[in-house]
């Protein structure tokens, strides 16, 4: 997911950085800009219940991380839900995972110093056909 | 998703910051620490094809963003795929979306100055019942 080594023409108005760790250590403004102006994420909030592979959302809190709260999906069933509302064991509910970037306080408990960290989170579940290995 | 206003006992070894923008502007080490040591994200890489709500992955590249490459899921069908491989008109494929944090170069083209940005990405697709039947 992460690719950062792109040469960019430097803007003369950039903050100066002669830090020996540059470009590893950068300045980040935590005043979040939200690009999701045209989308309402709440509209998909009931999919977890209506999916054929429904999931529950578990709160994962860590004050040493930014954001400190992340919601993790856990599939409710091993199989998928059929039209009758029963579990179909011929199909599998599986988590859809995504690697995301978070900020980890480093050194610990420091309010203004972070390190970028990659974590794997389960966002929701999908219903898949199991892989059947045919024996000759 | 984001919650940052937590009081943390300050570590005396923290870098000093008397910046007037503090705590909005922080130092971040871009040397990514990967916590996913026990997980193999490739294991879910074929779910996009085996799901009853399959999806394609589209590359979204932006050199002004960190990470510069993000993969976006687009559901292949409006309906879901049944056991025969045909569309089931009674079910819908929908994207599972997640708000993630990225770093946006600010001012533009600056290699060492960023602003935190929240964007909504589609991670995969799930199969849902279109109508919720409310029982009296």
């Amino acid at each position: 997911i992460v690719k950062a080594g792109i040469t960019i023409p430097r803007n003369p108005g950039c903050p100066n950085s002669e830090d020996k760790n540059f470009p590893r250590t950068v300045m980040v403004n935590l005043n979040i800009h939200n690009r999701n102006t045209n989308t309402n994420p709440k509209r998909s909030s009931d999919y977890y219940n209506r999916s054929t592979s429904p999931w529950n959302l578990h709160r994962n809190e860590d004050p040493e991380r930014y954001p400190s709260v992340i919601w993790e999906a856990k599939c409710r069933h091993l199989g998928c839900i059929n039209a009758d509302g029963n579990v179909d064991y011929h199909m599998n509910s599986v988590p859809i995972q995504q690697e995301i970037l978070v900020l980890r306080r480093e050194p610990p408990h420091c309010p203004n110093s972070f390190r970028l960290e990659k974590i794997l989170v389960s966002v929701g579940c999908t219903c898949v056909t199991p892989i059947v290995h045919h024996v000759a | 998703i984001v919650k940052a206003g937590i009081t943390i006992p300050r570590n005396p070894g923290c870098p000093n910051s008397e910046d007037k923008n503090f705590p909005r502007t922080v130092m971040v080490n871009l040397n990514i620490h990967n916590r996913n040591t026990n997980t193999n994200p490739k294991r879910s890489s074929d779910y996009y094809n085996r799901s009853t709500s399959p999806w394609n992955l589209h590359r979204n590249e932006d050199p002004e963003r960190y990470p510069s490459v993000i993969w976006e899921a687009k559901c292949r069908h409006l309906g879901c795929i049944n056991a025969d491989g045909n569309v089931d008109y009674h079910m819908n494929s929908v994207p599972i979306q997640q708000e993630i944090l990225v770093l946006r170069r600010e001012p533009p083209h600056c290699p060492n100055s960023f602003r935190l940005e929240k964007i909504l990405v589609s991670v995969g697709c799930t199969c849902v019942t279109p109508i919720v039947h409310h029982v009296a």
Epitope: - | H77, L78, N82, D84, G85, V87, Y89, H90, N92
Partner: antibody, heavy 120, light 107 residues
Framework: EVQLVESGGGVVQPGRSLRLSCAAS????????MSWVRQAPGKGLELVAI????????FYPDSVKGRFTISRDNSKNTLYLQMNSLRAEDTAVYYC?????????????WGQGTLVTVSS | DIQMTQSPSSLSASVGDRVTITCQAS??????LAWYQQKPGKAPKLLIS???SLETGVPSRFSGSGSGKDYTFTISSLQPEDIATYYC?????????FGGGTKVEIK
């Protein structure tokens, strides 16, 4: 140029049958979902039947279920609608329409329509 | 079935006027909405799908917006060739259903 041409309409008595055809040209017929949509005189549009690209999935609303059958012959680039047990309320212009995708959800090309009149 | 309530059923406006048509679904249709134009004696023509996506070749004066149950179709500057009946159609839940239509006339 995409073209859809319906045929087979006419006047028929209640209880009788009729078969409509839609000849497609100008696109790869076998990769598109198709539908029949009807419009009673002076009225709005009503879905009649849907079929996916390979004929493996179909759908009918309750108003025609059990009486109408949609089918396709991809080797002949033709869509069909078999209408049995016709009723006066089936009187309408019948359009065949193409979905821009495999399945038949919304319609980017329509034929000119064929009029079916059910009357004694 | 999902009911699509379109309003007004007819309207009369002058050339150059901004024209707005609304379509309300009986439940959330998650942006799965199409808009069609039908001229007298002709087949419908697709203008917009996905609530907002303009079809190729459709003039930019036509636009769609909305979410959830409520959707809007706008002609930013009415032209004489826009005289027609306009229909919305949901494709979230079968059977796909159409609004009753809005007949647009020139004053």
């Amino acid at each position: 140029e995409v073209q859809l041409v319906e045929s087979g309409g006419g006047v028929v008595q209640p209880g009788r049958s009729l078969r409509l055809s839609c000849a497609a040209s100008g696109f790869t017929f076998s990769t598109y979902g198709m539908s029949w949509v009807r419009q009673a005189p002076g009225k709005g549009l009503e879905l009649v039947a849907i079929i996916n690209h390979n004929g493996g999935s179909t759908f009918y609303p309750d108003s025609v279920k059990g009486r109408f059958t949609i089918s396709r012959d991809n080797s002949k680039n033709t869509l069909y609608l078999q209408m049995n047990s016709l009723r006066a309320e089936d009187t309408a212009v019948y359009y065949c329409a193409r979905d821009p995708r495999h399945d038949g959800y919304f319609f980017d090309y329509w034929g000119q329509g064929t009029l079916v009149t059910v009357s004694s | 079935d999902i009911q699509m309530t379109q309003s007004p059923s007819s309207l009369s406006a002058s050339v150059g006027d901004r024209v707005t048509i609304t379509c309300q679904a009986s439940e959330d249709i998650y942006d799965r909405l199409a808009w069609y134009q039908q001229k007298p004696g002709k087949a419908p023509k697709l203008l917009i799908s996905g609530a907002t996506s303009l079809e190729t070749g459709v003039p930019s004066r036509f636009s769609g917006s909305g979410s959830g149950k409520d959707y809007t179709f706008t002609i930013s500057s009415l032209q004489p060739e826009d005289i027609a009946t306009y229909y919305c159609q949901q494709y979230w839940s079968v059977p796909w259903t159409f609004g009753g239509g809005t007949k647009v006339e020139i004053k």
